[in-house]
Interface confidence: medium
């Protein structure tokens, strides 16, 4: 990679891309935008899906963490020939189908949707798109929109989680590269470390969870720290503090030495979780330590 910013978060990322007739001469720019962005999400626990829409929505690449499949998915994406109408809601339907399926399989992984379109959606199409985006949200997704050229920012603010979740690209398709850094920063939710990573058995502790994007939740009230103890019991705790780069969470009281708690974060009251490889372990502490 080029040493640019990267995201270490473990979640499910869906690209929903406009391939209607109006993007015919700009598909290369859309492709390179997605390719650049895809290579910056580098967690082995991150899964990705490519969905395109015009007069219907098509899942070009199903959700996968396999980097070889993602490479092949990008190759398929490059070959897309745009044409047809802007049925954005069809793209959201394809994402919701996958989210619903994953939830039904017992995976409660957080979902992030990045939807890109270039045109204003006419009355019915806007209504359908907003409805389907809400359905994705109800399944736990965070929705971002990228608007290029002739988009309606007010519409996109309704389809996305909020106006802060909209990335306007006013200078045409060639300017897409310019928002990679900001979209990565805003859409990335990652857990990087926990301090302390070792706690005393049987004692109360608070843990500072270091990371990024914790204030990206639609409602900071719904952020939770989750501790999966010895790969079995899961305890959720509301944080004392929710800041963009850290959470301050009460750690569960782990009674025995050698117990392990894997750390996850939910942005939606436990509907789904950002996974990490951060582990908190217990040790024996004497009275003086």
């Amino acid at each position: 990679e080029d040493g640019g910013p990267a995201c270490y978060g473990g979640f499910d990322l869906y690209f929903i891309l406009d391939k209607s007739g109006s993007v015919l001469h700009h598909w290369n720019e859309i492709y390179y935008f997605v390719e650049q962005l895809a290579h910056r999400f580098i967690s082995p626990q991150l899964r990705m899906s490519f969905i395109v829409f015009s007069t219907r929505g098509t899942t070009l690449m199903k959700l996968t963490e396999d980097r070889e499949q993602i490479r092949q998915g990008l190759e398929e994406l490059q070959k897309v020939l745009p044409g047809g109408d802007t049925y954005m809601h069809e793209g959201f339907e394809r994402a919701s189908e996958q989210i619903y399926y994953e939830n039904s399989q017992g995976y409660r992984t957080a979902s992030v949707i990045i939807a890109l379109t270039d045109g204003e959606l006419h009355e019915d199409l806007f209504f359908y798109s907003e409805r389907e985006a809400n359905r994705s949200r109800d399944l736990g997704a965070i929705v971002y929109c990228v608007g290029v050229k002739d988009f309606n920012e007010t519409q996109l603010a309704r389809i996305a989680d909020s106006k802060d979740h909209v990335f306007p690209v006013n200078d045409g398709f060639q300017a897409l590269q310019g928002i990679i850094h900001s979209i990565l920063k805003k859409s990335c939710i990652e857990i990087l470390a926990a301090e302390p990573s070792t706690i005393c058995a049987g004692e109360s502790f608070q843990v500072v969870v270091r990371g990024n994007g914790f204030r990206h939740a639609r409602n900071v009230d719904r952020v939770l720290c989750s501790f999966k103890i010895n790969d079995s019991v899961t305890l959720n705790e509301k944080p004392f503090a929710v800041e963009d780069t850290y959470l301050l969470c009460p750690a569960p009281i782990l009674k025995e030495v050698g117990m392990k708690a894997a750390l996850q974060v939910s942005m939606n009251d436990g509907l789904s979780f950002i996974s990490s490889s951060v582990i908190i372990t217990t040790t024996h502490c004497s009275d003086g330590s």
Epitope: S204, P239, F240, P250
Partner: antibody
Framework: QVQLVESGGGLVQPGGSLRLSCAAS????????MSWVRQAPGKGLEWVSL???????YYADSVKGRFTISRDNSKNTLYLQMNSLRAEDTAVYYC?????????WGQGTLVTVSS | DIELTQPPSVSVAPGQTARISCSGD??????VSWYQQKPGQAPVLVIY???NRPSGIPERFSGSNSGNTATLTISGTQAEDEADYYC???????????FGGGTKLTVLG
């Protein structure tokens, strides 16, 4: 709707003990951190103690070692056991639903420490 | 431990904008909540996480946080807004929840 009702306040001599209770209703009590906040007569608010949903406990330096916070999730009740009371502990004690903000408060119970 | 400093009092004419500040060295790192307390009543949360308004709180209440200062703004102040206002934040090295000293808002007239 959320309701928090404190009880157990009263007059106590310096060095004495008192146990405050806070009965909670209208929300899933065991999912929330809970806190005690006090206000001395004519003064500002002071955080006293907090217990997380998983029963981890935290105290302000001014009460550490003297006060104990606890909860009984089966009774939807929060407690504050106050020992070795001092004149400066005189205050209205509020129970509040907590976390990084106090979004619901009880009406408070007055604790007076005086000989 | 963090310390939050508020002006003891602020006066405003009805219909005007009241601004109450809350300053502290660590405020740039932490979000701030604001509480309104009327005489003989329990405090009420009016703003949390710098600028979020709980349901039921009028839109004239807003919050911001920049530099070393968080600000509670009440636009179109009404007589019923006369109360004590407290800011509250926390420390990232302990769960200590800290309150400012409080500001008495007087609505003139």
């Amino acid at each position: 709707q959320v309701q928090l009702v404190e009880s157990g306040g009263g007059l106590v001599q310096p060095g004495g003990s008192l146990r405050l209770s806070c009965a909670a209703s209208g929300f899933t009590f065991n999912s929330y951190a809970m806190s005690w906040v006090r206000q001395a007569p004519g003064k500002g608010l002071e955080w006293v103690s907090l217990i997380s949903s998983g029963s981890s406990t935290y105290y302000a330096d001014s009460v550490k070692g003297r006060f104990t916070i606890s909860r009984d999730n089966s009774k939807n009740t929060l407690y504050l056991q106050m020992n070795s009371l001092r004149a400066e502990d005189t205050a209205v004690y509020y129970c509040a639903r907590a976390g990084f903000k106090f979004d619901n408060w009880g009406q408070g119970t007055l604790v007076t420490v005086s000989s | 431990d963090i310390e939050l400093t508020q002006p003891p009092s602020v006066s405003v004419a009805p219909g005007q904008t009241a601004r109450i500040s809350c300053s502290g060295d660590s405020i740039p790192n932490y979000s701030v909540s604001w509480y309104q307390q009327k005489p003989g009543q329990a405090p009420v949360l009016v703003i949390y996480a710098d600028s979020n308004r709980p349901s039921g709180i009028p839109e004239r209440f807003s919050g911001s946080n920049s530099g070393n200062t968080a600000t509670l703004t009440i636009s179109g102040t009404q007589a019923e807004d006369e109360a004590d206002y407290y800011c509250q934040s926390y420390d990232n090295t302990s769960p200590d929840l800290v309150f400012g000293g409080g500001t008495k808002l007087t609505v003139l007239g």
